[in-house]
Every structure is written in structure tokens, then in C-alpha cells.
């Protein structure tokens, strides 16, 4: 369940913390999984463990694996696992994919780029920085702590930026690299043709009769404010209100803005006390804006006795 | 399939002892806690103890502390809830539950279906 | 012994609603915090472990997170089957306690 990811090069120092959480006073015992075989907590040793933290400095090749961390806490012992892979330094300047950490968007107002893992490094500022292996220079470029901020960021901005620090270690020095792409975000804001994220075109829900259901009918019109974005349901071809059952209501439109910065909106229908009848309406969830109108049906249908009782 | 199975309803009258027990399966029942909470009609959920079926090593609530016995027999794979003198605010639902291994742990991830305790005169 | 003191003590919310359940520790217990759900007449259930991670078989609807003492459990969309008591419970130290629940019903 508690495994986590690690990688480094050979040669430089990698530290890597338990997946499993636990207060700094607890102690954590560190083991080779293959071999069961305790790290020792010695600091003259190359690999050692130093509670929540396994270091290898320097790192070697013959390291990769998989090793096995257990927190004593005064309750219950916890086990987590960090698979460990240590790479070849690569020759040219190429950064292979499994070398990257996670990708971070920014634009023209933010920026930041943090450098992966440094958190778990004894370093001193100022860190350097690369691009695509060229050293950043110019007055664009600020390092601040423990990340890169770029002012007027353009889209020719995107790219792999690698952080440089040193790591030490009583006195000795270890070299870390790490890299991750930067990619760069417009934040205009556009239209589009609405697109329904639910319910799906021409899907069926089951319902119990006497029981309520709800039909939520959510559309996406594009990014930022829209001029005319509208979500609506029909019966029958029917608009709600031309359609005399105080059973079944449609709630006011709700806008919604997704990660993804999408506008949408949601409208719920409600149906209270669930007839036979319902089932032999079509409902329409209608999205409509200036490029036009999608419109996509969903049908009701008796819950199954057999599937309920299971 | 992992499941805890618990002994059935139970009434006593006060002053009688009574031992209940929850039987383990689908998985090594010696290598994982197994512990006891109680609820009392219309309340919230009290942790009472622990046992480790293969040292027998046990933990208490100190609520519960010298109120009741923790066992188990491993070669059946059944653990026990029991009391000497039963009284009636005794009256409660217990259930077990598995509390992870010597070497893991993930919250109480398997529980009994629970025993109904009725302790009235 | 680590009290822990959940809140609101019942809630009422509609169909589709976020719902947000805290729980708060008398110590700091780092992360070792759990949420169960206990359906009327029946055993709980184990949800979430180590304040955040999502049991087997649990829908993604349901999270947590926190560390310390202050700790969050949310429901994003509520759903009809949702109906229950919600406990937290602590682990870092014996004896281990819950919180006194939250019954949370359908409007």
C-alpha cells in the first residue's frame, strides 16, 4: 500500500524519506527487502538510515531496489516501502523521461519553480539553474530559495529545467540534480460549441418508484466569463414550466469553475415521489450558447428487484 | 473473503459472568490485533482493548482495565470478550475488530457484525 | 488519554452537496487518524487511514486530510447511501479513542 518512487544518479547523493508518516521522536528501522538486512544508523557508512530518512552518499547504480521502512510508534508499527532506482549519468544533454519529476504549469502572473525533493537536503541558497542544460543568465531569471521565479513568462519559456544544489553532509559535499518540465499556460479566456459532461447522450438511470432522483445536466462553455452560457432541461420537448407536474422541479442554474479553469454550469432536476409515468418520459439536458445547442437525453427505468436485494 | 463472525445476542442477568467470542478467518489470524469496542444504545464508539493471538499479548483501555478479560485460542482462531460480574450498564453492542499486524497497521479494517449484551434483573 | 472532538455533532444537507465533516485532537498525533462510517443497525466501516488515504473499495467522493491536530473529512457529492454516523479515531497512542460522530442526514 505505502510505496513511493525514488531516483537518482550515481555520484551524487540521494536522500529518501518512509512513505510512512510518524513524529520525529519515533524510531524508524530501515532493512534491505530482498535480504531482511538492517541499514546501519552509522554516518560513516555510504547508505545509512537517519530515522525517517535514507541517504546514499554518494549514490551507486547497485543501490536500486527495494527497501523496507518501519516506524515503531507507541501504538501500532507502520511499514512503508521506497523502490529506489539509481541511473547512469546520461552523456549528452538529453534528460530521459524517467529522470523528471512532475511537470508545473505557470503563467504571465505566476511562475514559481520549485526544485524537486530539496526539502530533504542540508543546502545553502543560491541554487543553479538550467534549461534544457544551458545555465540561466539574465536579469529575467531570479533564483529565490528554493525555487526559480521568471518575470514576463512567454511561451517559448516552456521547456526542462534542471536544479543544481549541494548537499552536506558533516562537512562533506554531495552534488544533486534535479529536472522538471515547465509548460505555459494561456489565460485568456475563449468560447466554444458547449460540451455536456453529464448526463452522458442517451444513458439510462435506474430509479425506485415512491423514491426521489435527481438528473444533474452540467455543460462546459470554454474559459473565463461568458457572454451567453445556458443550461436547461426539457420534458418531452417540453420546457419545465410548460409542463404542469409540481413533482418535478428544475433548480437554478449553478456556474462552476473546474481545475482545468473550464466554465461550466449545472442544473439539477429534482423529481420527488417517482411514478410509473416518469418512465416513459424523455428527458433533455439542453447546452446552449453562441455557437450553438448540444442537447443530450437520458431515460428513467425501474430499478431491478433482484440487483436491489443483493 | 476476510471476515470477523461474533457469537449471538446475549441476555444476563446482573451478577452473572458471560464470555463472548469472535472467530476469524481468510486470513492468519495469529499475525493481527484483535480488538474490542463497545457501544451503548444510542452513543458513540469505545475503544476497550487489544489482543495478539500469537504472543497473547494484550492493551487495555484503563476505562475498561480489570472490568474485562481479552483472549484468544489461536488453534481455533477465536477471540474472547468476558466478564465475571456482569452488570446492567453493561448493556451495549460490542463488536471486534482487526487492528493490522506485529509489522503494519491501517486503522481497524475488519470488524464483527457485533454482539447485542443485555444485562437487566 | 487523546480527546478528540468532532464536529457538528449532526448535519443536514441535499443531494450533490460537498459535506465537511473536522475532528480535532487534545495532542498532536501526527497523522495517524482514521474516519469510519456507521450505517443504522450496522458495524462500522473503515474509510480513510492515515488521515488521507482512501481504503480499498471506498469512493473517490470521500476524503481526508489534516495532520497534527486538526484534521478534515469530506463527502464532494453527497449521495442518498451516504446516510450514516461518521467517527474519527486516533491511533498514536492507548488507549485509542474516537470522536463522539457525526450523523449526517438528507434534506
Known amino acids: 500500500k505505502f510505496s513511493k518512487q525514488s531516483w537518482g544518479l550515481e555520484n551524487e547523493a540521494l536522500i529518501v524519506r518512509c512513505p510512512r508518516q510518524g513524529k520525529s521522536s519515533y524510531i524508524v528501522d530501515w532493512y534491505y527487502s530482498q535480504t531482511n538486512k538492517s541499514i546501519p544508523t552509522q554516518e560513516r557508512n555510504r547508505v545509512f538510515a537517519s530515522g525517517q530518512l535514507l541517504k546514499f552518499l554518494p549514490a551507486e547504480v547497485a543501490d536500486s531496489g527495494i527497501y523496507t521502512c518501519i516506524v515503531r510508534s507507541p501504538t501500532f508499527n507502520r511499514t512503508g516501502y521506497a523502490n529506489v532506482t539509481i541511473y547512469k549519468k546520461q552523456p549528452d544533454c538529453n534528460v530521459p523521461d524517467y529522470l523528471m519529476y512532475s511537470t508545473v504549469s505557470g503563467s504571465e502572473k505566476n511562475s514559481k519553480i520549485y526544485c524537486p525533493t530539496i526539502d530533504l537536503y542540508n543546502w545553502t541558497a543560491p541554487l543553479e539553474w538550467f534549461k534544457n542544460c544551458q545555465a540561466l543568465q539574465g536579469s529575467r531569471y531570479k533564483a529565490h530559495k528554493s525555487f526559480l521565479v521568471i518575470d514576463n513568462v512567454m511561451t517559448d519559456d516552456a521547456g526542462d529545467y534542471t536544479c543544481k544544489f549541494i548537499h552536506n553532509e558533516n562537512g562533506a559535499n554531495y552534488s544533486v540534480t534535479a529536472t522538471r518540465s515547465f509548460t505555459v499556460k494561456d489565460e485568456q479566456g475563449f468560447s466554444r460549441f458547449p460540451v455536456i459532461r453529464a448526463p452522458a447522450h442517451n444513458e439510462t438511470k435506474e430509479v425506485e418508484i415512491g423514491e426521489n432522483t435527481n438528473l444533474t445536466c452540467s455543460a462546459c462553455f470554454g474559459k473565463g466569463a461568458q457572454f451567453l452560457a445556458a443550461v436547461q432541461w426539457q420534458l418531452n420537448g417540453n420546457k419545465i414550466t410548460d409542463f404542469s407536474e409540481p413533482r418535478i422541479q428544475q433548480e437554478e442554474g449553478q456556474n462552476q469553475s473546474f481545475s482545468d479553469g473550464l466554465a461550466c454550469v449545472n442544473t439539477v432536476l429534482r423529481i420527488a415521489d417517482v411514478k410509473e409515468e416518469d418512465l416513459l418520459l424523455r428527458y433533455d439536458c439542453l447546452a446552449l450558447n453562441l455557437h450553438g445547442l448540444r442537447r443530450h437525453t437520458i431515460r428513467l427505468s425501474r430499478k431491478n428487484p433482484i440487483d436491489h436485494q443483493s | 473473503e476476510v471476515q470477523l463472525v461474533q457469537s449471538g445476542a446475549e441476555v444476563k442477568k446482573p451478577g452473572e459472568s458471560l464470555k463472548i467470542s469472535c472467530k476469524g478467518s481468510g486470513y492468519s489470524f495469529t499475525n493481527y490485533w484483535i480488538g474490542w469496542v463497545r457501544q451503548m444504545p444510542g452513543k458513540g464508539l469505545e475503544w476497550m482493548g487489544i489482543?495478539?493471538?500469537?504472543?497473547?499479548?494484550?492493551r487495555f483501555s484503563p476505562s475498561f482495565q480489570g472490568q474485562v478479560t481479552i483472549s484468544a485460542d489461536k488453534s481455533i482462531t477465536t477471540a474472547y470478550l468476558q466478564w465475571s460480574s456482569l452488570k446492567a450498564s453493561d448493556t451495549a453492542m460490542y463488536y471486534c475488530?482487526?487492528?493490522?499486524?506485529?509489522?503494519?497497521?491501517?486503522?481497524?479494517?475488519?470488524w464483527g457484525q457485533g454482539t447485542t449484551v443485555t444485562v437487566s434483573s | 488519554d487523546i480527546q478528540m472532538t468532532q464536529s457538528p455533532s449532526s448535519l443536514s444537507a441535499s443531494v450533490g452537496d460537498r459535506v465537511t465533516i473536522t475532528c480535532q485532537a487534545s495532542q498532536d498525533i501526527s497523522n495517524y487518524l482514521n474516519w469510519y462510517q456507521q450505517k443504522p443497525g450496522k458495524a462500522p466501516k473503515l474509510l480513510i487511514y492515515?488521515?488521507?488515504n482512501l481504503e480499498t473499495g471506498v469512493p473517490s467522493r470521500f476524503s481526508g486530510s489534516g495532520s497534527g491536530t486538526d484534521f478534515t473529512f469530506t463527502i464532494s457529492s453527497l449521495q442518498p447511501e451516504d446516510i450514516a454516523t461518521y467517527y474519527c479515531q486516533q491511533d498514536d497512542n492507548f488507549p485509542l479513542t474516537f470522536g463522539g460522530g457525526t450523523k449526517v442526514e438528507i434534506k
Open positions: 492515515d488521515a488521507s
Open positions: 489482543i495478539y493471538p500469537g504472543n497473547s499479548d494484550t
Open positions: 475488530a482487526r487492528h493490522g499486524t506485529s509489522s503494519d497497521y491501517y486503522g481497524l479494517d475488519v
